[in-house]
Every structure is written in C-alpha cells, then in structure tokens.
C-alpha cells in the first residue's frame, strides 16, 4: 500500500527522489571505473512523517510505534522502492569491460 | 553484496533485528483485529556506519556521499531485508476471518 503523497512539512521536505552530482573520486571509484567521469546519483532523501508514502504494513506499524516510543523506535526511513540500471566502463587486466549495475541509481522512493 | 557484519560502534549498536511488544491499541488495530491481543513486532533498528551490512551498490554510494556531504546526504538506514508472515484474526461484517500478512514482521535487516 502506497500511502499519502501530500507532504505536511512543506513542498520538497518529505521523502522523494533527488540527484547528487558525484565524481569518480567522490565515490572512491577512480581506480576501477573509466567512464562516466561524473555521475548524477539519484537517491531518496527526505522526512517520512506519519503514513507518507508508507511502503507496506511494516512501515505503518513503525509510524505508530515511533509515535508511542520515539526514543526506542525510529521513524520510517526514505529508501529506494526501485532502481534504474546504469552502465559503467570498467578497467580490467586486459583492457576495459562494460558492466551493468541494477542497484545503483534509485528510480522511485518510499518510506519503510 | 552484503558487507561487513562487525559493528564498530560496539555490540548491538548497529543495524539489527529488535523486538518491540505492542498492544492492538498501540498499533491502532483494536477496531479491526481480534487476535493476537498483543504483537511481538520484529523491526530493524540501529546505526549504519560505513559499509556495515550494505544492501547493495546504492548503499555503498550513499555511505561515500554522506561522508562527503553530511548535511545534504543522509547515512544509510536500517530497514528490513526480508519479512516473516503473520496471521491476524480480523473482524468482518459476518464474523471473523484469518488473514496472512507478508510484510508485517521484519525477518532480517540491512542498510540502504
């Protein structure tokens, strides 16, 4: 169940997809990746207030228990619901290879 | 890729499975669930320091970018990697029914 998409904290403050620009050096990839030199990393960032984009029943429970026991149970967390594939050109012993990574770029976000 | 399981913050401080006892009232279920009256909710709680139980490549990237831009990119978050099913006895218009929920109780945790 994908719950409410209205953010009570104000536009853009709740869990959603963002891009963060990163170089190979930033990612610690400079020694094994040739291309791209720069990556627009899509990631899920933002708050998860009560029932906002709740991924499932577990997320709904977590919201209830966080309200009851905020020091014990954390609020739900904004994480990828799905990913977009990305191709990296990697250095190999013999030259280069193309490798597709299916779990690198977030495509969609939810709270869990 | 499931990365290191050694917690640098000390035993039990990093992302792992916890149990939180909750009543139907706590969960807001009293009006639609008959049994169980109390649930041992298993959930994922704890810190996600660098590469601890990194769920995938995305989690590894998130760790790197959080180190670089702590005010912009949050640290990876401790969430369920899988779930255990749970049967609830629910109230219906005609009496009761047994319903299995596959996404209610966390079984295993990772950082993402």
């Amino acid at each position: 169940a994908r719950n409410g998409d209205h953010c009570p904290l104000g536009p853009g403050r709740c869990c959603r997809l963002h891009t963060v620009r990163a170089s190979l050096e930033d990612l610690g990839w400079a020694d094994w990746v040739l291309s791209p030199r720069e990556v627009q990393v899509t990631m899920c960032i933002g708050a998860c207030p009560s029932q906002f984009r709740a991924a499932n029943m577990h997320a709904q429970i977590k919201t209830s228990l966080h309200r009851l026991k905020p020091d014990t149970v954390p609020a739900p967390c904004c994480v990828p619901a799905s990913y977009n594939p990305m191709v990296l050109i990697q250095k190999t012993d013999t030259g280069v290879s193309l490798q597709t990574y299916d779990d690198l770029l977030a495509k969609d976000c939810h709270c869990i | 890729a499931r990365n290191g399981d050694h917690c640098p913050l000390g035993p039990g401080r990093c992302c792992r499975l916890h149990t939180v006892r909750a009543s139907l009232e706590d969960l807001g279920w009293a009006d639609w669930v008959l049994s169980p009256r109390e649930v041992q909710v298993t959930m994922c709680i704890g810190a996600c320091p660098s590469q601890f139980r990194a769920a995938n490549m995305h989690a590894q990237i998130k760790t790197s970018l959080h180190r670089l831009k702590p005010d912009t990119v949050p640290a990876p978050c401790c969430v369920p990697a899988s779930y255990n099913p749970m049967v609830l006895i629910q109230k219906t218009d005609t009496g009761v029914s047994l319903q299995t929920y596959d996404d209610l109780l966390a079984k295993d945790c990772h950082c993402i």
């Epitope: 997809l17 963002h18 891009t19 620009r21 170089s23 | 831009k69 912009t72």
Partner: antibody, heavy 118, light 111 residues
Framework: QVQLQQPGAELVKPGASVKLSCKAS????????IHWVNQRPGQGLEWIGD????????KYNEKFKNKATMTADKSSNTAYMQLSSLTSEDSAVYYC???????????WGQGTSVTVSS | DIVLTQSPASLAVSLGQRATISCRAS??????????MNWFQQKPGQPPKLLIY???NQGSGVPARFSGSGSGTDFSLNIHPMEEDDTAMYFC?????????FGGGSKLEIK
C-alpha cells in the same frame, strides 16, 4: 554557517586580466561544486561554468571558453576565476555559488563588480 | 542551449493578492523523473536567493507563500499572499543541461 566571500570590486584596464576569488567557509569546500555566474549592469544572469574543487575538473559555457579559467585551491578553500583579454563588454558583477541537490545553487557570494576602463 | 522565456516581464500585484510568473523552456528540463527548474529572487545590489528548486521544492528558510509547479517545458512561480518584501526581480533557471541557462527575469512590484 555557509559563506562564500568575494572582494567587492576590481578596476582593470582593457586587454588586461583579472583573477577573481571566492573563499568558502562553514562547510567542506571539496564536497560541493562551485559555479560562476555573471550579470551585466541592468541585465539578466549568465552561467559561466563550474568546477569540482576535489579534482579541479571544470565545465564551461562555450561562450566563455576563451575568456574564463576556473581553478580551486584546496589548501585555502578558495575558488578562482581568471578573466583574460578584458574589454568593456566584460564589465559585470561576477558571482560564485555552491551547488547542492538537484543542480540547485543554494549559497551565493555577494559578487565582485568588475569594471573594465582605461 | 535550452532557452527559457519568462512572462510577464513585469507585473504589479496588490498586497495580499497572488502573483504568478511563468517560465517556458525550449525543450523539456525533466530527467530521472525530476524537473530541473529552479527559481531565484534578486533584490537590487544583492545576489540571487534560491526560492524553489526542482520545480516545486522550497529552498531552506523560504516562506510558505512561495510555491512552484510544472514539469517538462512549462513552469510557474506563485507568491500568495503578496507582501511588501516580495518586490524584486525573479529568475527561472534550468540545471538539466550544460550550459545552465536563466530566464530573462520578471520584475514584481506592488500595485
């Protein structure tokens, strides 16, 4: 708090060069791209280019490729932009700004007013 | 280059009323499901101030009366209710493609 400090003004002669500075404080300088934008008197804003202070790699607006050179000094947390072969057309306010999420420039310097005059 | 056309070039709005500024891009500024359109406010003698990023997200410390909407090629900035302090130039800017480009600006005044 995040700050980008720029000198207030520079007066330069036609044909000369000027090196503008942008000193960052309140955050990790090497973690965020720095952009340069100019604004001619009474005009709109124009993007010149950006630089990644962590590796010195930069991108330029084609229009400024032979005019501007961006550098960054990690030891002093300062970004620089050198403008060469100046003409009166280059008289403008030059801003530096920091890029955050989604390509948004969240913090800006106060700008350096460059006047090219003999 | 992506060309951004702002309208109107100037507008006067009564205090408490709604001001709407439009920005049209010559091609879509959407990518990865995100609209790379930002809005800035600029007052005389000051640098631009980020109001809205990624089409609809409020910048840090920006009052709730500023909101942005749109996707693809058509975007708008809304200010409601209009306050005295909102007299300024407003610029849209795309960050989808190098070179990043700005709209020509819209001058907002009090009626």
């Amino acid at each position: 708090q995040v700050q980008l400090q720029q000198p207030g003004a520079e007066l330069v002669k036609p044909g000369a060069s000027v090196k503008l500075s942008c000193k960052a404080s309140g955050y990790t300088f090497t973690s965020y791209w720095i952009h340069w934008v100019n604004q001619r008197p009474g005009q709109g804003l124009e993007w010149i280019g950006d630089i990644n202070p962590s590796n010195g790699r930069s991108k330029y607006n084609e229009k400024f490729k032979n005019k501007a050179t961006m550098t960054a000094d990690k030891s002093s947390n300062t970004a620089y932009m050198q403008l060469s072969s100046l003409t009166s057309e280059d008289s403008a306010v030059y801003y530096c700004a920091r890029e955050v999420l989604d390509g948004a420039m969240d913090y800006w310097g106060q700008g350096t007013s460059v006047t090219v005059s003999s | 280059d992506i060309v951004l056309t702002q309208s109107p070039a100037s507008l006067a709005v009564s205090l408490g009323q709604r001001a709407t500024i439009s920005c049209r891009a010559s091609e879509s500024v959407d990518n990865y499901g995100i609209s790379f359109m930002n809005w800035f406010q600029q007052k005389p003698g000051q640098p631009p101030k980020l109001l809205i990023y990624a089409a609809s997200n409020q910048g840090s410390g920006v009052p709730a009366r500023f909101s942005g909407s749109g996707s693809g090629t058509d975007f708008s900035l809304n200010i409601h209710p209009m306050e005295e302090d909102d007299t300024a130039m407003y610029f849209c800017q795309q960050s989808k493609e190098v070179p990043w480009t700005f709209g020509g600006g819209s001058k907002l005044e009090i009626k």
